[in-house]
């Protein structure tokens, strides 16, 4: 007789998720290094050839702040969009009635630091729809689990997430 917790009768427990601490980033390397989101490839403007690399995200389960009233925050690379959509599901599962909220996506106004991945549509700043800061550490952890290549509990008011470039080998191989 196989005792409890052994053999085929073993129940798989869901992974215990630990919230990120304020100012923590995962992986524990600089954002624009190979082990994270990779190098900055250059600013994308509405007039540039690379603008077509950006795709709008109309996911109804995500709230976009769109403070510029231009729809810019909805624009992102496909990889960023995929990870964001995955995260939106996790957020609703984690906190019923709460949605993922994006405060910054692609930026064309120069509001970010030089060589920010926001200028390439590879970064988003996120909160929960209720703006409850006690949730942000766990939100960051969910972003890691959703597959963002670099997640940073950057501010008390948001989490910063970024992804590798579309043409990066690691991105294509799903690494």
């Amino acid at each position: 007789i196989i005792g409890p917790g052994r053999g085929f009768g073993k129940r798989r427990h869901p992974k215990k998720l630990t919230p990120l601490a304020y100012k923590q980033f995962i992986p524990n390397v600089a954002e624009k290094t190979l082990g994270a989101s990779g190098r900055y490839e250059g600013k994308i403007t509405r007039n540039s050839e690379r603008f077509k690399e950006l795709t709008p995200n109309y996911n109804p389960d995500i709230i976009f702040k769109d403070e510029e009233n231009t729809g810019a925050d909805r624009l992102m690379t496909q990889r960023c969009k995929d990870k964001l959509n995955a995260l939106a599901i996790s957020v609703m599962n984690q906190w019923p009635g709460v949605k993922l909220r994006v405060t910054e996506g692609w930026d064309e106004d120069g509001h970010h630091s030089e060589e920010s991945l926001h200028y390439e549509g590879r970064a988003v700043d996120i909160t929960t729809s209720d703006r409850d800061r006690s949730k942000y550490g766990m939100l960051a952890r969910l972003a890691v689990e959703a597959g963002f290549d670099w997640v940073y509990y950057e501010s008390k008011a948001h989490i910063h997430c970024s992804v590798k470039a579309e043409n990066s080998v690691a991105a294509k191989s799903g690494g």
Epitope: Y22, K65, E67, T103, D125, T127, D130, R131, D132, R133, S134, K156, A157, H158
Partner: antibody, heavy 123, light 107 residues
Framework: EVQLVESGGGLVKPGGSLRLSCAAS????????MNWVRQAPGKGLEWVSS????????YYADSVKGRFTISRDNAKNSLYLQMNSLRAEDTAVYYC????????????????WGQGTTVTVSS | SYELTQPPSVSVSPGQTASITCSGD??????ICWYQQKPGQSPVLVIY???KRPSGIPERFSGSNSGNTATLTISGTQAMDEADYYC??????????FGGGTKLTVL
């Protein structure tokens, strides 16, 4: 030079009204959230009301809610505070102060203050 | 309503370090600003977002925020630092609130 100049203070009877103005100059007024903060004689600072830069958010302290109304005119670079049903406890110096945050996701503190205008509520 | 508590007064000798505390529930989830106000003058922002100094504010002013307590530290305190100091908290779901103020006396 970045400057905020308050006006409109004075002596008013309990139950009366006053309208304070704050004239801004030397910066892009529409890009900043604006605040009214008051200080009763010999007391500490008390936040009164805020008008966010996006014009989407207006906040009031519980002590003035329903009696005071904040407004702004970006074309005139001006902030206003309409004070109705004034009480003795509203007696204070009223300061206008700016902040570049939007009060929803960003807050940077009030980095420029006016010199204040005095409101006295007394019979 | 949310409350911030400061000691009414703090004394320090010239050249020594002054620490002014500000306490409130779950304060580390909020951003803290500190203001200096000298008699007859308007307040001046000396620290924002817990630890940042506006341009023109001397390096001897620093801030921290952990747990339920934020602290303004003035190292090498000078006579000109004698003033009232106010902490102020912000988060996206509560209005702005000021602490009661602390009178710093440089002995």
């Amino acid at each position: 030079e970045v400057q905020l100049v308050e006006s409109g203070g004075g002596l008013v009877k309990p139950g009366g009204s006053l309208r304070l103005s704050c004239a801004a100059s030397g910066f892009t007024f529409s890009s900043y959230s604006m605040n009214w903060v008051r200080q009763a004689p010999g007391k500490g600072l008390e936040w009164v009301s805020s008008f966010s830069s996006s014009s989407s958010y207006i906040y009031y302290a519980d002590s003035v809610k329903g009696r005071f109304t904040i407004s702004r005119d970006n074309a005139k670079n001006s902030l206003y505070l309409q004070m109705n049903s004034l009480r003795a406890e509203d007696t204070a110096v009223y300061y206008c102060a700016r902040d570049r945050g939007d009060y929803v996701d960003y807050y940077y503190g009030m980095d420029v203050w006016g010199q204040g205008t005095t409101v006295t509520v007394s019979s | 309503s949310y409350e911030l508590t400061q000691p009414p007064s703090v004394s320090v000798s010239p050249g020594q370090t002054a620490s002014i505390t500000c306490s409130g529930d779950k304060l580390d989830y909020k951003y803290i600003c500190w203001y200096q106000q000298k008699p007859g003058q308007s307040p001046v922002l000396v620290i924002y977002q817990d630890i940042k100094r506006p341009s023109g504010i001397p390096e001897r002013f620093s801030g921290s925020n952990s747990g339920n307590t934020a602290t303004l530290t003035i190292s090498g305190t000078q006579a000109m630092d004698e003033a009232d100091y106010y902490c102020q908290a912000w988060d996206s779901n509560t209005p702005l609130v000021f602490g009661g103020g602390t009178k710093l006396t440089v002995l």
